[in-house]
């Protein structure tokens, strides 16, 4: 059992069938030492009697919220929330696997810059009773600070037959040099709590490889003359990294239809134009990618060629 | 990048050039270890991340373009020793930072020239012969080091007399790999910034 | 499968013009472009210039303007390359490629030879 | 235009060699670069598009590298079907230019 913050503990519980559980001993806040009950939740039931109160935690009807009192005043409240480990694995039931870019990929994270700032996500399909909390260190034996907000809820979707929630936060370091070359990464812990269960969920990454930049602003076509081509130009995104001489952008350009079966002219550069053909009812669509490490392009920025 | 190769600058081009190589060639090398030491911890999840460069050169604090010099937490060690002028830079650009920043990658280079030639000679002596170091890596690093042109003491090949272990010569590779990557990358931003400048 | 088959080889007087076809089998003649690429006796790849079977859209390259035209005709999912003005120098094999990218070839005919000779 | 250099012009090697081509481009194309194989009598085949980018049915032992202006094409372990020519062509801008070909024929 250890405290996860004041007056909540976690229990940790082997689970599975006819498991012996945890004895739990609780002891009453109180410079009090007779007199003293025990409840559960909203029960009156008494459970025991005296300043500690010893228990057996087997599964949730076990877990909760124990109060002590003494003649009607409540002296103190010790909420019990499981962590389940079942064959030796930590149960992850609380968000979903993203599977994206491997299997029990819970928490994704990305960063528009190497300013030290990125954003993590996770998803769920509960939608009641359910609470985060997110820290996140440079390292983990000497740890760096990095400082988390709130985790919010920032989608609703709808999956064929269930709602799926987006949670997000934003995380800086507190001390970020963006030139510097990392050598220990960010970790990021998240606690998750829903009703009496406990999860903690972690991820370990260098901003380098979590870089995705915004899409290309600005775009604007020039037609030239006597031919199929358009020059086709753009600016670096505000939010990308300075001086743009040192972070460096590489840019795909595509044009191409509606469908994503259909032709297309594709080509790379370093500058900020390219010469493409344009196709009635196409679209020219711009993205960006750090020239020098190859972390994830940008989402398209996309103009119709008409 | 974009400067025609007929006509480079003879300033920063030649070194701006052989830096874009230099980050192909190591990239390259390090998805070869990757897919051939695919049972080895190779991945940057799974190694280590040592810099043998720490504490012996200050690639990053003294190539810190001008633009980030107000960010206090890029001047943490920021070192000020006086060092002679290299060849890549024509002498109208030339300040004081700039031969700094060009002499530290020199001696970057120079250390991992060493470690990548002492490896090799190790990997050679495997009766797998598994994986060799890319010999283009190599000269594309003998190439920046001669375009940077500057006089330093020859550092002499490590040379072991004990068996070597291979299975940590290959671990200590994907770490030097990796490591290097990241010094390549670093480089290349360098040399772009000040052609730009 | 996606094909590409070219009409059989011709044998021209300098001065005249040529026409070669290519026959698109195995997808939608209209959703590939369709390019022509040269090759002279023990010679590299030349391109000559490019068709959107769409709409009918081409790009030629400088050195073939005015001389060459390429067509597309989509009720039989067929291209042509005709090239007029001929010369000894246009002695070469002719290669129609198609590809869902413009700048590149991914499938390629068997080639064409046409020989300029008086 | 954009002039395309191959070399070497041929190169002699025996099965299980590793063989680098290589192609320059007059000016920087980014990695709008692609490799393409003939053998005789035959028409040209896909390799590798866009520099590195490898073509479903292409055997891995074909890789593609390089962006700016130097590009090339490595064959990791020579079999005696890949004895052919090899053409590089840039995709930077029209018109399209091909290099002058690489022949690997058997040492």
């Known amino acids: 059992i250890w405290e996860l913050k004041k007056d909540v503990y976690v229990v940790e519980l082997d689970w599975y069938p006819d498991a012996p559980g945890e004895m739990v001993v609780l002891t009453c806040d109180t410079p009090e030492e007779d007199g003293i009950t025990w409840t559960l939740d909203q029960s009156s039931e008494v459970l025991g009697s005296g300043k500690t109160l010893t228990i057996q935690v087997k599964e949730f009807g076990d877990a909760g919220q124990y109060t002590c009192h003494k003649g009607g005043e409540v002296l103190s409240h010790s909420l019990l929330l499981l962590h389940k480990k079942e064959d030796g694995i930590w149960s992850t039931d609380i968000l979903k696997d993203q599977k994206e870019p491997k299997n029990k990929t819970f928490l994704r994270c990305e960063a528009k810059n190497y300013s030290g700032r990125f954003t993590c996500w996770w998803l769920t399909t509960i939608s009641t009773d359910l609470t985060f909390s997110v820290k996140s260190s440079r390292g983990s034996s000497d740890p760096q600070g990095v400082t988390c907000g709130a985790a919010t809820l920032s989608a609703e979707r709808v999956r064929g037959d269930n709602k799926e929630y987006e949670y997000s936060v934003e995380c800086q370091e507190d001390s970020a040099c963006p030139a510097a070359e990392e050598s220990l990464p960010i970790e990021v812990m998240v606690d998750a709590v829903h009703k009496l269960k406990y999860e903690n969920y972690t991820s370990s990454f260098f901003i380098r490889d979590i870089i995705k930049p915004d899409p290309p602003k600005n775009l604007q076509l020039k037609p030239l003359k006597n031919s199929r081509q358009v020059e086709v130009s753009w600016e670096y995104p505000d939010t990308w990294s300075t001086p743009h001489s040192y972070f460096s952008l590489t840019f795909c350009v595509q044009v191409q239809g509606k469908s994503k079966r259909e032709k297309k002219d594709r080509v790379f550069t370093d500058k900020t134009s390219a010469t493409v053909i344009c196709r009635k009812n196409a679209s020219i669509s711009v993205r960006a990618q750090d020239r020098y490490y190859s972390s994830s392009w940008s989402e398209w920025a996309s103009v119709p060629c008409s | 990048r974009n400067l025609p190769v007929a006509t480079p600058d003879p300033g920063m081009f030649p070194c701006l050039h052989h830096s874009q190589n230099l980050l192909r060639a190591v990239s390259n090398m390090l998805q070869k270890a990757r897919q051939t030491l695919e049972f080895y911890p190779c991945t940057s999840e799974e190694i280590d991340h040592e810099d043998i460069t720490k504490d012996k050169t200050s690639t990053v604090e003294a190539c810190l373009p001008l633009e980030l010099t107000k960010n206090e937490s890029c001047l943490n060690s920021r070192e000020t020793s006086f060092i002679t002028n290299g060849s890549c830079l024509a002498s109208r650009k030339t300040s004081f930072m700039m031969a700094l920043c060009l002499s530290s990658i020199y001696e970057d280079l120079k250390m991992y020239q060493v470690e990548f030639k002492t490896m090799n000679a190790k990997l050679l002596m495997d009766p797998k012969r598994q994986i060799f170091l890319d010999q283009n890596m190599l000269a594309v690093i003998d190439e920046l080091m001669q375009a940077l042109n500057f006089n330093s003491e020859t550092v002499p090949q490590k040379s072991s007399l004990e068996e070597p272990d291979f299975y940590k010569t290959k671990i200590k590779l994907c770490i030097l790999l990796h490591a290097f990557r990241i010094r390549a990358v670093t480089i290349d931003r360098v040399m772009s910034y000040l052609n730009a400048s | 499968e996606v094909q590409l088959v070219q009409s059989g080889a011709e044998v021209k007087k300098p001065g005249a013009t040529v026409k070669i076809s290519c026959k698109a089998s195995g997808y939608t003649f209209s959703d590939y472009y369709l390019h022509w690429v040269r090759q002279a006796p023990e010679k590299g790849l030349e391109w000559m210039g490019w068709i959107d079977p769409e709409n009918g859209d081409t790009e030629y390259a400088p050195k073939f303007q005015g001389r060459v035209t390429i067509t597309a005709d989509t009720s039989t999912d067929t291209g042509y390359l005709e090239l007029s003005s001929l010369r000894s120098e246009d002695t070469a094999v002719y290669y129609c490629?198609?590809?869902?990218?413009?700048?590149?070839?991914?499938?390629w005919g068997q080639g064409t030879l046409v020989t300029v000779s008086s | 235009d954009i002039q395309m250099t191959q070399s070497p012009s041929s190169v002699s090697a025996s099965v299980g060699d590793r063989v680098t081509i290589t192609c320059r481009a007059s000016?920087?194309?980014?990695?709008?670069l692609h490799w393409y194989q003939q053998k005789p009598g035959k028409a040209p085949k896909l390799l590798i598009k866009f520099a590195s980018q490898s073509i479903s049915g292409v055997p891995s032992r074909f890789s593609g590298y390089g962006s700016g202006t130097d590009f090339s094409l490595t064959i990791n372990s020579l079999q005696p079907e890949d004895f052919a020519r090899y053409y590089c062509?840039?995709?930077?801008?029209?018109?399209?230019?091909f290099g002058g070909g690489t022949k690997v024929e058997i040492k």
């Open positions: 490629a198609a590809n869902k990218e413009l700048r590149y070839f991914d499938v």
């Open positions: 062509q840039q995709s930077n801008s029209f018109p399209l230019t």
């Open positions: 000016q920087s194309i980014s990695i709008n």
